[in-house]
């Protein structure tokens, strides 16, 4: 059982492993994977991890490339956990409105919005 | 048929309407709505709009409060459109890896990650 690694450290390590194994991963020239056409990544986590699954099934395993896919699986687990927390707490309307206001505020300032 | 309004302008107007109608919206003292417990809003769009639906069904309609819910419905439509674009384009592995790297980079720098 691996020692618990903080998610932030896990993401950093995964970025490094992705860079290390890039040549191996792109070896399959004919493989096509769905790629989101916008940068609001959080909306596309399902498709991203489906793509990772496709890639894993087409990649020769062994060594640290296994570690890469293991990390990606742990990141998926973290995100699934976050999604579960979307509806956990039932609160008064004023609190829901404050969250909605924050959501729209972030959408207003940080999302990449195409007309 | 209303004139198309850019989504960014729609979000701004909705924020203003939300502020205007707050007192009316919070009048139901006993209503409880699920509130996400983290700031990664994009992961929770489904729950947020379910909450909006609950609120709309409990709110006396009329005047500009209808405009608020209409706007929120258009924002949902925009987000649903963005979600459809998550899996539309099938690309070569190197392009998928670029997107994955960007996704992890954003997760590394912008997400609020609790250990």
């Amino acid at each position: 059982i691996p020692t618990e690694i903080p998610t932030s450290a896990l993401v950093k390590e995964t970025l490094a492993l992705l860079s290390t194994h890039r040549t191996l991963l792109i070896a399959n020239e004919t493989l096509r994977i769905p790629v989101p056409v916008h940068k609001n990544h959080q909306l596309c986590t399902e498709e991203i991890f489906q793509g990772i699954g496709t890639l894993e099934s087409q990649t020769v395993q062994g060594g640290t490339v296994e570690r890469l896919f293991k990390n990606l699986s742990l990141i998926k687990k973290y995100i699934d956990g976050q999604k579960k927390k979307c509806g956990e707490e039932r609160r008064r309307v004023n609190q829901f409105l404050d969250y909605l206001q924050e959501f729209l505020g972030v959408m207003n300032t940080e999302w990449i919005i195409e007309s | 048929i209303p004139t198309e309004i850019p989504t960014s302008a729609l979000v701004k107007e909705t924020l203003a309407l939300l502020s205007t109608h707050r007192t009316l919206l919070i009048a139901n003292e006993t209503l409880r709505i699920p509130v996400p417990v983290h700031k990664n809003h994009q992961l929770c769009t489904e729950e947020i709009f379910q909450g909006i639906g609950t609120l709309e069904s409990q709110t006396v309609q009329g005047g500009t409060v209808e405009r608020l819910f209409k706007n929120l419905s258009l924002i949902k439509k925009y987000i649903d459109g963005q979600k459809k674009k998550c899996g539309e384009e099938r690309r070569r592995v190197n392009q998928f890896l670029d997107y994955l790297q960007e996704f992890l980079g954003v997760m590394n720098t912008e997400w609020i990650i609790e250990s």
Epitope: E89, R90, N94, Q101 | R32
Partner: antibody
């Protein structure tokens, strides 16, 4: 289990500003399910709500104190703070910080602040 | 702004039933929360949403709310129940929290 701990000076001079900080452990202050609140209790009296803040920065204050109160949040330190300006002896009280969902779920142990010259 | 009125004190013998009231205009349309506070300690929630008990609170504690009065009832009162009890509501017109003045429960004995 969420834990809250108040910190700050126990003695403040009249006309000065009372400053307290509440450190939250066991949960992120960015938890959208909570407001973060300050309450005080004058010696031998009932509870008085001072105000609360959402992680986004939205604040709500008791109208009777509004002109003197500022509550702020520091998500990076998992803390929120209270500033009460132009204090008088009438502001002598035990000050509590608390997490506020639909009700006050978790409380700090309270800190006594005395206003005296 | 909204005002909650509680009696300053209530006395009861052990084993009897104590009733602590909290008055407010049309309080029956609001959710009421009750807190117990023992000397030198922070308050603890004993009843939420009018009549629901948090886990760990004895069944002897119950609540009701209608019209202009909410009531906290403590049956089979024990010496350890001696404390201050405060009611709380939200004033939805302003998003403000309102506390009652508190009631000191004395267990005679």
């Amino acid at each position: 289990q969420v834990q809250l701990q108040e910190s700050g000076p126990g003695l403040v001079k009249p006309s000065q500003t009372l400053s307290l900080t509440c450190t939250v452990s066991g949960d992120s202050i960015s938890n959208g399910g909570y407001y973060w609140s300050w309450i005080r209790q004058h010696p031998g009296k009932g509870l008085e709500w001072i105000g609360y803040i959402y992680y986004s920065g939205s604040t709500y204050y008791n109208p009777s104190l509004k002109s003197r109160v500022t509550i702020s949040v520091d998500t990076s330190k998992n803390q929120f703070s209270l500033k009460l300006s132009s204090v008088t002896a009438a502001d002598t009280a035990v000050y509590y910080c608390a997490s506020l969902g639909n009700w006050f779920d978790y409380w700090g142990q309270g800190t006594l602040v005395t206003v005296s010259s | 702004s909204y005002v909650l009125t509680q009696p300053p004190s209530v006395s009861v013998a052990p084993g009897q039933t104590a009733r602590i009231t909290c008055g407010g205009n049309n309080i029956g349309s609001k959710n009421v929360y009750w807190y117990q506070q023992k000397p030198g300690q922070a308050p603890v929630l004993v009843v939420h949403d009018d009549s629901d008990r948090p886990s760990g609170i004895p069944e002897r504690f119950s609540g009701s709310n209608s019209g202009n009065t909410a009531t906290l009832t403590i049956s089979r009162v024990e010496v350890g129940d001696e404390a201050d009890y405060s009611c709380q509501v939200w004033d939805s017109s302003s998003d403000h929290v309102v506390f009652g003045g508190g009631t000191k429960l004395t267990v005679l004995g």
